[in-house]
Amino acid sequence: ELCDDDPPKITHATFKAVAYKEGTMLNCECKRGFRRIKSGSPYMLCTGNSSHSSWDNQCQCTSSAARNTTKQVTPQPEEQKERKTTEMQSQMQLADQVSLPGHCREPPPWENEATERIYHFVVGQTVYYQCVQGYRALHRGPAESVCKMTHGKTRWTQPQLICTGETEPSQFPGEEEPQASPDGLPESETSR
């Protein structure tokens, strides 16, 4: 069941999921100057069964200038640079290789994808928070939020995290210290 709203906002923090539960939608958003092709789903869907899950539908962006120059998903290395891919992101994607039954990994980027990924999460999804670069995490408890169903309504638990001061960003679960992370978490790996 789809969560009614988005995970809580924490000042100076971003969040991401390590894996996405079946039923999760990822909107096919394109960067400025590009738009989603007119045929095809407006989102990708994490779908499958208990043994194997994958993203259904593929996002494709085309130039807003009338010419129909649609290109297929996987971007070239120079285009990946344009999407501010950092070493930290690739470390996260390695962490995502761990297969959880009934979950999908982070989908690969598509060409001319928007800088921010917009997910519609489902009940039971956990997202993990970290402070953006330049802010230090003060933990009063777990820096995570879970979408729960209570009395027929969905709600996100409040992450016990405050981001303050000057220091390196903290990490998501199961990740090693990155060698270099000039940008911290790329925007494309977050949702507001």
Epitope: S41, D56, I118, H120, R192
Partner: antibody, heavy 114, light 107 residues
Framework: QIQLQQSGAELVRPGTSVKMSCKAA????????IGWVKQRPGHGLEWIGD????????NYNENFKGKATFTADTSSSTTYMQLSSLTSEDSAIYFC???????WGQGTPVTVSS | DIVLTQSQKFMSTSVGDRVSVTCKAS??????VAWYQQKPGQSPKALIY???YRYSGVPDRFTGSGSGTDFTLTISNVQSEDLAEYFC?????????FGGGTKLEIK
Amino acid sequence: QIQLQQSGAELVRPGTSVKMSCKAAGYTFTNYWIGWVKQRPGHGLEWIGDIHPGGSYTNYNENFKGKATFTADTSSSTTYMQLSSLTSEDSAIYFCTSRNFAKWGQGTPVTVSS
Amino acid sequence: DIVLTQSQKFMSTSVGDRVSVTCKASQNVGTNVAWYQQKPGQSPKALIYSASYRYSGVPDRFTGSGSGTDFTLTISNVQSEDLAEYFCQQYNSYPYTFGGGTKLEIK
């Protein structure tokens, strides 16, 4: 709590135009497309088009090109639809919808009558 | 444009029964189909997305199925509050289109 609050009922003259609003609350307005849907008794639901408030991209159903115009004001998280050259065929309830059609406004009834 | 046909405009059922509302697309739409419930004087309420996934708060007696061109919304153990009109919608390609609706009447 995510809400789409639409403006009130309109009674308008044929040949004039009308502008209705849809105010979003409880989510990041610029992240999600806002769609508009027309409902007339006996005609079911008709998708008019949608607008992305973040980049002001629009898509229009061919049947409504020249009839409907979408705009968005990010400062007030409000989307507008203007309908022009109104005729009795435009008398209907108009709904706004967002978050991949999960959320719907309460509808704005429009009556075109002389 | 893709045409969605809900062949039954009216369906009559009794409380506790099981009823299936069907929707046929004029071309393949994958699983990019949603179902809505509309009660008199209200705006449509989203029930199902991607053919078979329920929105939050939707009772599990509502089940969606199908892919390609044939889709079904099944209501098991029908309740009196299910009296409403049910619409299918495709969002596989622009313009998005809706079925003509099926009115569920409770005997």
